[in-house]
Structures are given as structure tokens and as C-alpha cells.
Amino acid sequence: SIPWNLERITPPRYRADEYQPPDGGSLVEVYLLDTSIQSDHREIEGRVMVTDFENVPEEDGTRFHRQASKCDSHGTHLAGVVSGRDAGVAKGASMRSLRVLNCQGKGTVSGTLIGLEFIRKSQLVQPVGPLVVLLPLAGGYSRVLNAACQRLARAGVVLVTAAGNFRDDACLYSPASAPEVITVGATNAQDQPVTLGTLGTNFGRCVDLFAPGEDIIGASSDCSTCFVSQSGTSQAAAHVAGIAAMMLSAEPELTLAELRQRLIHFSAKDVINEAWFPEDQRVLTPNLVAALPPSTHGAGWQLFCRTVWSAHSGPTRMATAVARCAPDEELLSCSSFSRSGKRRGERMEAQGGKLVCRAHNAFGGEGVYAIARCCLLPQANCSVHTAPPAEASMGTRVHCHQQGHVLTGCSSHWEVEDLGTHKPPVLRPRGQPNQCVGHREASIHASCCHAPGLECKVKEHGIPAPQEQVTVACEEGWTLTGCSALPGTSHVLGAYAVDNTCVVRSRDVSTTGSTSEGAVTAVAICCRSRHLAQASQELQ
């Protein structure tokens, strides 16, 4: 019967006793940077080409006995998970292996850098179809390794890496922390984070998604027909590399940004038990388990968005945090979050010709996060309209006044430290959906976009009694682009998007009274693109 991990990544419509995905990734080449491999294993023979690249450190210890089957173990298993005949994800994908890890599974930053350069040169000399590079390794944070990954990604290569097996913040490791790389954490058959001895999968904002990574059956280098189960974020990353190969084989023109958005979109949502993660990391860690799309074609009509969290600002009074979208993505909204509730809001601002989301810490605050909503919106023309703090008691308001521009997000930023704690709620005038409303002491920023066929609407959900969390979701066919709290709601820690749901968090209700000050309203802006929908119907 089908191994649990292959069943897990298969959409229900393809589920059967056999794993038979619609396309095997035959147009894609996957580069594996790992240990040596046993290329004559019948699971991968003829599918994996061993390059002559080798850059590894000496093994530790004078008594180390170099045994071929042990040296090949990690790489052989991963090659099998990506493209193995029986237990592989992308059964049609061809692979090339580069040896950057020694027989003890250790490598160097320089060896990996030279390996990435080898791939870049190979690509220049003999351009082929789409390339996926699998980096099932993790070391301490390295600016130079992250920069090399960025260069390769900007040359059109998809890089997939392991989050690391240190039960720690993936942002502390490389290449997991490189924003251009697709970073993968590991889950088990119960969709729980993988525990490995006293450690386990890494987590946090640098993880893009999770994938099966415990008790994964794959080729064993013990013998040419041997199989073995292995666990870890390397195995999880191999699943995503296989899924990416299949997606790219079906749609070879996909950009890295489009691929990442699709991986996120088609993942299983909210199935991971977040209690396993440290409390401060739960909100930052994506609750996503990778899966194949239900159809490898026809996803082009959707408006894809993802949430990008910044690093923590730190606690100093004037500290800020910045969240950025990928080069091919549009920043459609910006929000902020502080565990202490002490923040001075957020705003969208231009940086290097591109909009970024900046959040501001407040005096006495423990720090803030900026949260960007990053979307794929072809031919978009977006701008930020700002209204400075108003004197009128009705508060500050700003709208999208340009013809054909729609509101995709609202942000507010203020200089005073205690904004909103003793102010009555400000009500949004009805029938004015293209408008952002805020406190009179705050400057309000509206993200206004023009794109063919783009339409948006505002959805609100208010709870009169105090509540730790208020949510509002966009309905089927609409995508959440903006998430904010209605002004006047006190004790708000911040707002952020989780998939298609806007979440507004408040302080622990036990510390607040049940007056109207405790009222919380979540405001979602939901958009869709009729242009994209029509384009896809024409293609079919």
C-alpha cells in the first residue's frame, strides 16, 4: 500500500492504493547537494547522474572507518524520496548529485558555495528546463551562503532547503534563513512537528511550510534493493523539491514567487498542533503541510497572497521592524503585532523602489513585528495614500481617489504612546468601502491598486464583549489582502493574516473590563481578479 507520506501529499481526488500523480516532473532537473550516493540502487538507477563535483572536509577522528554504504546513506535516501521509482514524489524527475557532505554528514560553507557556483556555471554553459536545487543541510547563520542562494534564485533557480533539526528558530541557520529559498520543516503521520531525540524540526518565520519528515521510506545504500526509513527536515525538503519539480513540469514558466505562492496555497492548512512550538514562535510559524495541487494546470486564475513576518524589532523605544515581499510580489497591505500591546502602528513606505512594511515599537514595549501581505498581481500599479493625523473628532480617513484604483489594505501609525486606550470607537461611515478610517492622532495609510479586473470588498466582524482573538475570513473565490483592527478598539496587540483569515489579537480579557472599550472589530479586505479568471478560462 502507499506509504503514509506519499498519501499525505496527494490530493483526495488522486488518492488510491497506488501513488500515481498526474505528472512526474519529467521536464525538470533536480540538483542534490549532499553526501555521495549509491547511483546503482534500482530505485534511482538511471535517474540520478553523479557529477564529478566533490568538496568535503576530512572526517573527524583518527578511528573513523569509511564505509561506502554509510557514506552514501543520506544522499541515496533523499534522491529516492525526490524521484525514486517506488517511494519517490516526482517519479519522472532527473537528478544530478554534488558531494558537499562527508561520510559523517558534515560539510563547509565554502564547499556549498562552490557547489552552488558549479550549478550556476552548468546552467550558463548548457541551459536546460526548470532547475530545482535541493539543499538538505543546515549550519549556523551565514550571510555569504544566503547571498549565494539569493544570486542563484534571481537567476531563475528554485532552491529548497531543510529548516534544520535543532528544535530552534530556523532564522538562526543557513541556508534556511535566506528569504529566496523555500525552507521546509518536518511533520509526522499525525501532522505534528517531528521530534528527533531531544531536538526536532526547526520552526519560525523563516519556515515557508512543513512536509512529511518522519519515518519516510526510501532507498537504502545498504544494498541495491534495500529500503529504510529516515527522519528529518532533509526528508521534508526532498518532498517539497519533488512537488516543485512536478509543478514546474506542468507549468515550466512559473517564477519562484509563483511557485512559492502555489506551494503555500495548496498546502493543508491548520493541521499542525502549534503547542509543540515555543509560545513566542507559534504566531510566526506557518501552519501548512505541503501537498500536490489537485490539478497541475488551471491555478493561474487565482489571486495568490502570503503573509511575511519581519524579524523582531527589539525593545528600544524607536525600534522598527521591516517586512519585505519578494521582487515579483506586490505589497498589498501592512499590519503590526506586539505581544505587550505597546506599539505605534505601521506604515508602508518606499525603499529601493519597492514598498516595504515598517512597524514601530512604543516606549515600554518589548518590540514589534511588521506583517506584510504579499501577493501575485500581474500588471498591478499600486500606491500608498496617506492622511496625516486629523483634528476632527471623527478621526482620520483616507480613500483611493484615483480612477480604477481599489483599496487593498489599511495601515495606521501614530506618535503618541497610549493611542486608543481611552477613546470611544470611531465608526466607519457606511457605503464607503474604499476608505481607511483611524484615530485622529494617527496617520492613516491606504494601499490603493489598479490591476486588470481587480475588485475588492471590506468585511468586518465585531465582538462587543472583550475577546482575546477576533477573526474574519474571506469567502471562497476571494483572497485576503488586508487585515486590520477598527480604530477605537482598545488593548489590541495587532492584526495579521493567517491564510484567508484576518486575526485581530487583544490583551488577555481578564485584564480588561467588559465595557465598550473591550469591543474588538476585525476588518478584512477581500479581493479577486476577474481578469485572471477570464484568462485561465481562455487557456483551457
Epitope: 534500482r42 546513506s73 521509482r85 519522472g92 534493493t225
Partner: antibody, heavy 119, light 113 residues
Framework: QVKLVQSGAEVKKPGESLKISCKGS????????IAWVRQMPGKGLEWMGI????????HYNPKFQGQVTISADKSISTAYLQWSSLKASDTAMYYC????????????WGQGTLVTVSS | DIVMTQSPDSLAVSLGERATINCRSS????????????LAWYQQKPGQPPKLLIY???TRESGVPDRFSGSGSGTDFTLTISSLQAEDVAVYYC?????????FGQGTKVEIK
Amino acid sequence: QVKLVQSGAEVKKPGESLKISCKGSGYSFTNYYIAWVRQMPGKGLEWMGIIYPGDSYTHYNPKFQGQVTISADKSISTAYLQWSSLKASDTAMYYCARDHGYKPFSDIWGQGTLVTVSS
Amino acid sequence: DIVMTQSPDSLAVSLGERATINCRSSQSVLYSSNNKNYLAWYQQKPGQPPKLLIYWASTRESGVPDRFSGSGSGTDFTLTISSLQAEDVAVYYCQQYSSFPITFGQGTKVEIK
């Protein structure tokens, strides 16, 4: 149910060519290997080679490499064993058998095809 | 190639009695990574194809009577028929499936005494 059905007995002359077949049914043909096994009269079993119909990967026993060709047509769930020039010593019963990647033993066998080569 | 050697070549046992067949491989077929012995036993009755009885040295194939059992590890293996029945008259083969070429033992013929 799962089964492998082989083509009928063949009587051939030395030097002639021959292609015998093995048709799978009741399971996903492309997801399992097909092995070919020879049994000469009154003798034991000899593994000749395998094919993975999903991508036509083959692996031969060196003893049979160059003597026979193993192929498959996944569209009709059929594997083949062929000779370009038969010899009298090729007289034997030939079995096809199914095996799975991580269970690489033969759980289902065809009924066998008897090939007789005689002048 | 891994050479498989069976003993005895033939065996005559009374109905209801125990039959024991041995198989030795020229190198170990036990692999530490998954702790499995890559060895199977087949039964072949006259005029029929072989039938899988035991795999992983000791796991009985579904539908196989429990009088058939396999044991052993590394290089030495045993197939035991605890109480021989008339329908058990056949040739029994061991097979290693760990490395190419896959190889069989020469066979052991079991008859009724």
C-alpha cells in the same frame, strides 16, 4: 484479482526470433517491477532480469545480458522477453513475476511459457 | 554474485512429521539500517509456477498455512514445515533479493516417506 497472464507455448527452430509476453491486471502495472525467471527442464530457477514499466528501466543478470531483451508497453500493461536468434539451450519454461520496490520479492507469478527450440 | 546453497537436495518425511530445509548465503543478507534479512522461500509444485511462502526470512505470506515458518539471520536460514501434509510435496527454493543478480538456491525436493 491480481494476476499475470503469459502467452502460450512456442516451438521454434534455432536462429529464429521470438517475443513472449506477460500481461498484468488487477493492479497498477507501472508501479511494480516485472522479473523474468528461467527454468530449464528438470532444473532450478534462474533470475534473468527485471523491468520497471513506469520508465522502462531494466537490469539484467550478466549471464543473460546481450542474449535477451526485456521490454514493456505500459499502455497495454504488458512486459516482453525476446530473443533475436534462439539456440537449443534456450529451451526452458519462462516465468514472469511481479515485485515491488521496497518488497523486492516475487509475490505474483505468471503461469509460465514453455519455449522449445529444436531443429 | 551471492551464491545460495540449500541442504539437503531432497528430503523424505512421514505425514505429520517435521520437515526442515536449510539455506546458506555466501554473504550476509541482513542489513543493519532496517534490520531485515533479504531472503524469501518459494514452493513449486509439479507443473505450476513458484509460490511465495516466506519473505524477510520469517514473515509468512498471507494465505500460507501456519505450519510453514522461516527462521535464521545473516547467512544461515531454515524453512520448517511443522507437520507435513500430502499437499506439501514440492520443490522448495530460497532466494536472496538484496543484490543483483537476484539468486536462488538449487532447490530441495520434499517427498512423503
